[in-house]
């Protein structure tokens, strides 16, 4: 679509003379019929295919023809067409007299013709120019022409239609050649696509406007190139959403139990040896003389009564020292004055001369010991209970009392809540502190994976086009990551596929 | 062939909220061409734009109804939503769910069937 | 608001040419689409960009804008052609249509 302008500049009749040579009464009164049609090599009457024009009376014989373009007015005259310029043309000038004001053709004596010109050639869509002068026996005329695209119309024939757009169906300006001149910040084929946020990532990031950068399900961070963890994920980490891979020393679907109770709560105190034993469990190995289940406790180093023979101990700085009864002497009061003669065996002992007499050795009934028989046996005090076990005496024989999660005669096995198989349908068990816990695979859930769920989302291979999957445990659902190129919930359809219709 | 189907309650009370979904079938909503739209068009009367929806979720509204109404998207379901909420009798209408072709400069060349929603009490 | 005006009505005997108008603030720098609707039926799309036509859209449609106006032509027009006929195009962001013109084959 375009327009054929035609600007009429100058119009020579000196003689005001008609066509015929039969001059005009009183003046030729002059207008023009202008017509525009497909090229021709020699110009001929019939249908004016790109269009008329006419203009009122603009001078009598000779005149200069005003522009008038700026008010509205007639010249240069517009000759439009709604068809691409084919880049060639005829053109017919005719100069006519009216001796009336009805300028209509059947309104005219054939021979108030005072011109007529014709000619044909090339012409390029631009904006400039073509000045051209035609003189015949009686009569100049000066003109200029040239064609110009329509509003919206661009390229070299005014094919094109393009307008320029700010809304969501596209953001641009028109080129000259028609082409889309995206706004900054758009992209695509009609400029309705925003450009991301540098750096956002292409797969699991988005934009609605320029600049942003919205992450997909399952990512995050700035430029969405963070996955998100399982929810409830404590101590792990994921290289795809949804996972929960836990940091070295920890355990469990959540990553939340502590397989390094040692170093990560540094129970054993001083200077103790931590040993990890299972889940929250750990050992401590005392240094001497200290002891207690995290070694907090300082021993007095007469508890391991060393004195012997019924020597009284006395705590000291540097360590003990025995008061001995009389008969007896030596660092633990281990030596003798006394022999069998003397009766020196208590609690029904019996005396055993050694060494020809100089020394002696009884020998105990059960519960007794001690050199002399002296002491009642006290089977606590090698402090034989593992596990922080507390000891009992009970007559002749001891006890260990176990603490919660250990049994064995020495409380040095660990009870396994697991041993009876409590978790169903194929869960793992895990043993707690105080208890057990199961990870029950998918499509089970409860306490004891009794409860049975939906399957993982995933083990239908519901993704196309190689797309991959991830499921979403908190949901049961599924999430397509989609390679470049295909979209769609489950990735089943290649972008940009062209428009049919329904009819 | 694309196809939309229209689907909610046909009567809804004064005050309420209308809630209707588009269900499309034979292409995909995140189609980076398409925005999906929804138009009224009261008993014996013309049509009225409500607005429409981008599969990232980009929405935009007729100002004249802009407080009133929510257009959301589900592309897992390939569907699309429409709320209007503290509806009114001037509210009924014939609601129309559509395809608007970026090629086609918005241009929407397929169109649900329409559903008929009355505001009555 | 933006408004698009069109004539309620046009009346056009089988074989001759109906012209519908839209009228609207500079329409001719905006692209309009045009949509037949029958009785109880859903608009149909039969122009769009000005004056493209979509496949399966008889050749006797066409359509141009320029100006405030942009035009829908039937030209040979056919009784199946009776319907009601709107104009829409969009302003910044929200799209609108013209209050509709029925055209009647008599």
């Known amino acids: 679509s375009g327009v054929f302008q035609l600007q009429l500049q100058e119009f020579i009749n000196e003689r005001g003379v008609l066509a015929s040579g039969r001059p005009c009464e009183p003046g030729c009164r002059t207008f023009f019929r202008v017509c525009l049609k497909h090229f021709q090599a020699v110009v001929s009457p019939g249908p004016c295919t790109f269009g008329t024009v006419s203009t009122p009376v603009l001078g009598t014989n000779s005149f200069a023809v005003r522009d008038d373009s700026s008010g509205g007015g007639r010249n240069p005259l517009q000759l439009p067409f709604n068809f691409t310029w084919p880049g060639t043309f005829s053109l017919i000038i005719e100069a006519w007299h009216a001796p009336g004001d009805d300028l209509r053709p059947e309104a005219l004596p054939p021979d108030a013709l005072i011109s007529k010109i014709a000619i044909q050639g090339s012409l390029a869509v631009g904006q400039n120019w073509l000045l051209d002068e035609q003189t015949s026996t009686l009569t100049r005329l000066r003109y200029s022409y040239r064609v110009i695209c329509s509003d919206n119309y661009y390229g070299d024939n005014c094919s094109r239609l393009c307008k320029k757009r700010n809304d969501h169906f596209g953001h641009y300006v028109c080129q000259p050649d028609g082409n889309l001149s995206c706004l900054p910040g758009w992209t695509g084929e009609y400029c309705q696509q925003p450009i991301c946020l540098s750096g956002c990532h292409e797969q699991n990031g988005y934009c609605s406007k320029p600049a942003e950068c919205l992450c997909r399900p399952g990512w995050q961070g700035r430029l969405c190139n963070e996955c998100i963890p399982h929810n409830g994920c404590r101590h792990g980490t994921c290289s795809t959403p949804w996972q929960c891979t836990c940091d070295e020393g920890w355990g469990g679907l959540f990553c939340d139990q502590d397989l390094n109770y040692c170093t990560h709560h540094s129970p054993c105190k001083n200077g103790a040896t931590c040993s990890n034993s299972g889940q929250r469990s750990y050992t401590c190995t005392c240094r001497p003389g200290y002891t207690g289940v995290d070694c907090e406790l300082e021993l007095s180093e007469c508890d391991s009564n060393p004195c012997r023979n019924g020597g009284s101990c006395k705590d000291q700085e540097d360590g003990y020292h025995c008061l001995c009864p009389p008969g007896y002497y030596g660092l633990h009061c281990e030596h003798s004055t006394l022999s069998c003669a003397d009766s020196p065996c208590f609690n029904g002992g019996s005396c055993r001369e050694r060494n020809q007499g100089a020394n002696y050795a009884c020998e105990c009934p059960p519960n007794f010991t001690g050199s002399n028989c002296e002491k009642k046996v006290d089977r606590c005090t090698s402090n034989p209970c593992a596990n922080g076990g507390q000891c009992l005496n009970r007559g002749p024989s001891r006890m260990c009392r176990c603490r919660p999660g250990f049994t064995g005669t020495y409380c040095e096995l660990h009870v396994s809540d697991c041993a009876r198989n409590p978790c169903a349908h194929g869960g793992t068990c895990h043993d707690l502190e105080n208890g057990l816990m199961c990870t029950c695979p998918a499509g089970f859930s409860g306490r004891r994976c009794e409860v049975r769920t939906s399957i993982d989302a995933c083990a239908s291979s519901p993704c196309f086009n190689r797309a991959t999957c991830y499921t979403d445990l908190s949901t049961d659902t599924f999430v397509c990551n989609c390679p470049y190129g295909f979209v769609g919930s489950r990735c089943e359809f290649p972008v940009g596929l062209p428009p049919s219709f329904p009819w | 062939e694309v196809q939309l189907q229209e689907s909610g309650p046909g009567l809804v009370k004064p005050s309420e909220t209308l809630s209707l979904t588009c269900t499309v079938s034979?292409?995909?909503?995140?189609?980076?061409?398409?925005?999906w739209g929804w138009i009224r068009q009261p008993p014996g009367k013309g049509l009225e734009w409500i607005g429409d929806i981008y599969y990232t979720g980009s929405t935009y509204y007729n100002p004249s109804l802009k407080s009133r109404v929510t257009i959301s998207v589900d592309t897992s379901k390939n569907q699309f939503s429409l709320k209007l909420s503290s509806v009114t009798a001037a509210d009924t209408a014939v609601y129309y769910c559509?395809?608007?072709?970026?090629?086609?400069?918005?241009?929407?060349?397929?169109w649900g069937q329409g559903t008929l929603v009355t505001v009555s009490s | 608001s933006y408004e698009l005006t069109q004539p309620p009505s046009v009346s056009v005997s089988p074989g001759q040419t109906a012209s519908i108008t839209c009228s609207g603030d500079t329409l001719g720098d905006k692209y309009v689409s045009w949509y037949q609707q029958k009785p109880g039926q859903s608009p149909v799309l039969v122009i769009y960009?000005?004056?493209e036509r979509p496949s399966g859209i008889p050749e006797r449609f066409s359509g141009s804008n320029s100006g405030d106006t942009a035009t829908l032509t039937i030209s040979g027009t056919q009784p199946m052609d009776e319907a009601d006929y709107y104009c829409?195009?969009?302003?910044?962001?929200?799209?609108?249509f013209g209050s509709g013109t029925k055209v009647t084959v008599l």
């Open positions: 829409q195009a969009w302003d910044s962001e929200t799209g609108v």
């Open positions: 960009e000005d004056s």
């Open positions: 034979g292409g995909s909503i995140s189609s980076s061409s398409y925005y």
């Open positions: 559509a395809r608007e072709d970026v090629i086609l400069r918005g241009g929407s060349d397929y």
